[in-house]
Amino acid sequence: LQDPCSNCPAGTFCDNNRNQICSPCPPNSFSSIGGQPNCNICRVCAGYFRFKKFCSSTSNAECDCTPGFHCLGAGCSMCEQDCKQGQELTKKGCKDCCFGTFNDQKRGICRPWTNCSLDGKSVLVNGTKERDVVCGPSPADLSPGASSVTPPAPAREPGHSPQ
């Protein structure tokens, strides 16, 4: 004999209290696959979360973060504050990048400047807290009399790119 519950589509549940008939999911609940004995409670996007997609009878709500925050974890399980470019988020809050490092994102940590000399190049544009060094041609490639910017202190390595 076929299980009568298997006929219940997504958006319904198999109601054992009503002779296993298919009942629609109550408000603020959903079932994304058929044949379920109950519906799942919809996710609520509150606090630093905001609705990216509202709940329907067949799919859960999806959240993202309010401006000034970004998602972490599968399905945006947490909102973490943004920092400014040129900063990194430490456990004690946003802090400026140390000399020789930069961050061109609003999240993550500061990255060491590119060390142009490792690839036989020279520094064309110095790095800042917000931007990586720009490397130019190798010193040998520069024509006589041409000058390159001297690297600022013992710079280490590279930078970051847009998402």
Partner: antibody, heavy 120, light 110 residues
């Protein structure tokens, strides 16, 4: 979907060079740093360096400086790692791995690995 | 450069909880990432930034980090969890920014 496909296994003699490629698809190649990590037989994971595919800027672990060169060809969305003056202890599986769009997080996508064997 | 210390192996029976530690000076101030590595497969990121799971990683895998120790916890372990697990941090102040722990072999008993 994001995919990183690496070149095939190589056998090299000591003193030679090897160049491993990593072709990216399913995302904007220039928007995400690429890292290289290796694992020698019976050993752990070892970070080698990164390249910014947008600018070509690199950072190499000090251990490999002078022997490693990381480059990219944006026209074919491919990153390369060349290791020169190979020694027997460079025998390892070499992986490319993508950074998730900002520095300080985990490497979210990895290539399948390229076995490099250095033997006389 | 920065050093991460992991136990070589951890053994646990199926259905039990495995805890893998990663020690480092003031590691609680850093963001720790964990990778699962099975033979002849590429590493898989299972926890990032101390405690966040990428999509597709089961909820029974979790992470924590404070003081000098970060911990990866696998509850209700299964045979398929048998693998090597590596912790990793970024250390921008050193000439070797990418740092991995030595790895821990998770052995499922029985």
């Amino acid at each position: 979907q994001v995919q990183l496909v690496q070149s095939g296994a190589e056998v090299k003699k000591p003193g030679a060079s090897v160049k491993v490629s990593c072709k990216a698809s399913g995302y904007t190649f220039t928007g995400y740093y690429m890292h290289w990590v290796r694992q020698a037989p019976g050993q752990g994971l070892e970070w080698m360096g990164w390249i910014n595919p947008n600018s070509g800027g690199t950072n190499y672990a000090q251990k490999f400086q002078g022997r490693v060169t990381m480059t990219r060809d944006t026209s074919i969305s491919t990153a390369y790692m060349e290791l020169s003056r190979l020694r027997s202890d460079d025998t390892a599986v070499y992986y490319c791995a993508r950074e998730p769009g900002y520095y300080g997080s985990g490497l979210d996508y990895w290539g399948q690995g390229t076995l490099v064997t250095v033997s006389s | 450069s920065y050093v991460l210390t992991q136990p070589p192996s951890v053994s646990v029976a199926p259905g039990e909880t495995a805890r893998i530690t990663c020690g480092g000076d003031d590691i609680g101030d850093k963001r720790v990432h964990w990778y699962q590595k099975k033979p002849d497969q590429a590493p898989v990121l299972v926890v990032y930034e101390d405690r966040y799971r990428p999509s597709g990683i089961p909820e029974r895998i979790s992470g924590s980090n404070s003081g000098n120790t970060a911990t990866l916890t696998l509850s209700r372990v299964e045979a398929g969890d048998e693998a090597d697990y590596y912790c990793q941090v970024w250390d921008s102040s050193s000439d070797h920014p990418g740092v991995f722990g030595g790895g821990t072999q998770l052995i499922i008993l029985g």
